[in-house]
């Protein structure tokens, strides 16, 4: 094995390199010293490093490592951030289109129900948007609220337009009757099933993308331990102390050091793999009633069908509601 | 039969073309994202190697630094010597991940559990019936003859063609629309969003 070349007799080269790291500081010895105070770059002979230099090298090594890590994850981070933003915006546009389709359906088929219908439809789709973004709203409650709100308007405007103003305090009864008489048939249940399934999947898809960003951000900004800093210093900078400026670390040695430094980070690997594969499975299943685009853009049609169902049964419903929403049953038996 | 929004605003010829062309839908966008993500599936296990290959490492040189001395690149000492009589690498590994890493692992475990639950094929048989038939049978109220069978394929009349929506530059804002005007009202930000869908890397 060849003997190490003698260190630079004046430590000049080391000084000029170190000046780039720490301009203006006089920490580099003029000539090689024994270096008995060194803790990382333990010398086998005279050295051009001081304790202060060693500390600076450690700091620099850890900074280098952080930068390398950030550049390693830059492409992945950009991919997820950009897609999360694109999908969020796309979902909002779908919701907006779905709202407009539904409003157009009311405007063209049931003009007498507007503007109240617009208001209820608007509230429903606002809740849809909030749900997708993670708000703590129950989808069944959203759908129930839509139909509970619509029915009194349908009853008073379409089914019983001659109702005197004095009878308009029956709105609350009509809301209750809507569920108890199942006035819309099974359409609300159908919509609940489709909307809740598609929105749940959409919401978790966005949550997963946002968590992906959080994972990258976390590993991106890791602070490496002192031990790791010492290993990196020994690998990248201790050769300088011997005046070996152009020498590079051995490949195998670098891998061993990196594995040591990144032991914690590498533990994420198993869960990261599972994350991508689980996300793929979710995406593969996002069709038909699991596809919010498909479900929401078709809602106007299902709502229209549900109103037609009410109209078809209007005669029977009006009679039953006349009884149920009377203030007292006794009126009818006097 | 209802006027449907596409009957009002979308030229039938355009509609037919849009249906047969390969559109960039949200669904194809999602699949594209997954394909790109899959190329990063080994991201964390490959990190040590990635960082070594992106930092100065002896590749073509005969000699390299092993942490203590200059050695020949293929000698036993190239990987081993630098670790001798130093702090224990095994100890470093044994410390376990930092609290922030443990936390993020817990979050990953949780989302993976959720993702798996949502993707479970069990229960999809029921969904299939609901999807195709409209309703569970036997839940029809009093009059069996009034039991609805759902609207079949006609039920969802708007296919998921977001690019085609974008290209039509059409945003029917009934709230804003004056009177009964049936004009398409383009919204710049919406259009650009969908054209940008293709530019994400």
């Amino acid at each position: 094995q060849p003997p190490p070349p003698p260190p630079d007799a004046t430590c000049h080269q080391v000084r000029s390199f170190f000046q780039r790291l720490q301009p203006g500081l006089k920490w580099v010895p003029e000539t090689p010293v024994p270096g008995s105070d060194l803790q990382v770059c333990l010398p086998k002979g005279p050295t051009c490093c001081s304790r202060k230099m060693e500390e600076k090298y450690q700091l620099t090594a850890r900074l280098n490592m952080e930068q390398l890590l950030q550049s390693a994850s830059m492409e992945l981070k950009f991919l997820i951030i950009q897609n999360a933003a694109v999908f969020q915006e796309a979902f909002e546009i779908v919701v907006r289109h779905a709202k407009n389709y539904t409003n157009a359906m009311f405007k063209n088929n049931y003009p007498s129900l507007t503007p109240q219908a617009f208001e209820f439809v608007g509230e429903f789709f606002t809740d849809v948007s909030l749900y997708i973004l993670g708000s703590d709203i129950n989808v069944d409650d959203m759908v129930n609220e839509l139909f509970d709100s619509l029915f009194p308007v349908i009853y008073t405007q379409l089914m019983n337009p001659g109702l005197p103003d004095s009878a308009l305090d029956i709105n609350e009864c009509l809301r209750g009757a809507r569920r108890d008489l199942k006035v819309f048939g099974n359409f609300p249940k159908l919509i609940m099933t489709q909307v809740s399934k598609s929105l749940q999947v959409t919401r978790i898809f966005l949550q997963a993308l946002n968590l992906g960003i959080e994972v990258i951000n976390t590993t991106d900004h890791l602070k490496f331990s002192k031990d790791c800093g010492r290993m990196l210093t020994r690998m990248w900078y201790c050769s300088y102390c011997q005046g070996l400026m152009m020498v590079k670390p051995c490949g195998g040695y670098c891998n061993v050091v990196m594995q040591g430094c990144m032991a914690g980070v590498v533990e994420i690997d198993k869960y990261w793999r599972e994350y991508i594969l689980s996300l793929e499975e979710l995406v593969n299943g996002m069709y038909r009633i699991y596809d919010m685009e498909n479900v929401l853009l078709g809602l106007f049609s299902t709502i229209h069908d549900s109103i037609q169902y009410v109209q078809k049964n209007a005669g029977k419903l009006t009679t039953t509601i006349g009884k149920l929403c009377a203030h007292s049953q006794q009126r009818q038996y006097r | 039969s209802a006027y449907y929004p596409e009957d009002l605003f979308i030229d039938k010829k355009v509609l037919k073309v849009a249906h047969v062309e390969h559109e960039e839908t949200l669904s194809s966008r999602r699949r594209e994202l997954i394909q790109k993500l899959k190329s990063f599936i080994s991201f964390y296990s490959a990190l040590p190697g990635y960082i070594c290959s992106h930092s100065p490492v002896a590749e073509n040189d005969t000699l390299c630094w092993n942490g203590q001395e200059l050695v020949e690149r293929y000698s036993q000492k190239a990987a081993r010597n630098g670790m001798k009589n130093q702090f224990n690498l095994h100890e470093l590994k044994m410390k376990g991940p930092e609290p922030v890493v443990s936390q993020i692992i817990d979050k990953l475990k949780h989302i993976n559990q959720l993702l798996r639950t949502m993707s479970m094929p069990k229960g999809r048989v029921l969904d299939k019936n609901l999807d195709e038939e409209g309703f569970e049978s036997g839940d029809c109220g009093d009059d069996e003859d009034e039991c609805i069978g759902g609207s079949g394929d006609g039920m969802i009349k708007v296919k998921n063609q977001l690019r085609f929506l974008a290209e039509l530059a059409y945003d029917l804002d009934v709230d804003d629309a004056p009177g009964n005007s049936q004009q398409a009202t383009p919204k710049d930000n919406e259009i650009s969003t969908f054209h940008n869908l293709g530019n994400v890397h």
Epitope: D169, H327, Q329 | -
Partner: antibody, heavy 117, light 108 residues
């Protein structure tokens, strides 16, 4: 005229269940709610739950969820209330009452339930 | 839940006397959902006054009801022997539907 006829008095052991019935006549059974109300000896009235026989929809007082179960049989115009895991606290007279959305108009004669070992 | 407080809990009145009993709700109740029931020992309750002021079938005209929001009352313009009973106010507005503790009216 409207009548609600309730089943006879019950003497039951603690931990057991009891099923009370309320047979309606004089009106269309499926058009009105049937409510159940509890009255302990010398005490006031406490609403338990209601059912709409037309659809089977039920609404419970949170306090009685898991304790009371309401059902209705359209063919016989009869409403039922099953009361489970009985304790001495459940000893009371139970009334059924039919109602519109607003008012409990007609009441059954009541069924006395005594829980005793 | 809405708590209904009736006062007085027990009262006695002479025949021909005007009687008023009150029912106070812990939060507002719509007048459409506030009712009064009469119950005599060993009998089931009977609807007496519905939606605050409407007399149920067969109830004598000497009875009247009034009120709004959280304060309601039942009045007998001239007490008669058959009026001795317990009267319950009841809100059928917000679940769980509740009854007042009752006002027991006795003959003096």
């Amino acid at each position: 005229q409207v009548q609600l006829k309730q089943s006879g008095a019950e003497l039951v052991r603690p931990g057991a269940s009891v099923k009370l019935s309320c047979k309606a006549s004089g009106y269309t059974f499926t058009d009105y709610y049937i409510n159940w109300v509890k009255q302990r000896p010398g005490q006031g009235l406490e609403w338990i739950a209601r059912i709409y026989p037309g659809s089977g929809n039920t609404y419970y007082n949170e306090k009685f969820k898991g304790k009371a179960t309401l059902t209705a049989e359209k063919s016989s115009s009869t409403a039922y209330m099953q009361f489970s895991s009985l304790t001495s606290e459940d000893s009371a007279v139970y009334f059924c009452a039919c109602s519109t959305y607003y008012t409990m108009d007609y009441w059954g004669q009541g069924t006395s339930v005594t829980v005793s070992s | 839940q809405i708590v209904l407080t009736q006062s007085p809990a027990i009262m006695s009145a002479s025949l021909g006397e005007r009687v008023t009993m009150t029912c106070t709700a812990s939060s507002g109740v719509s007048s459409s959902y506030l009712h009064w029931y009469q119950q005599k020992p060993g009998s089931s309750p009977k609807l007496w006054i519905y939606t605050t002021s409407n007399l149920a079938s067969g109830v004598p005209a000497r009875f009247s009801g009034s009120g709004s929001g959280t304060s309601y009352s039942l009045t007998i313009s001239s007490m008669e022997a058959e009026d001795a009973a317990t009267y319950y106010c009841h809100q059928y507005h917000r679940s769980p539907y509740t009854f007042g503790g009752g006002t027991k009216l006795e003959i003096k």
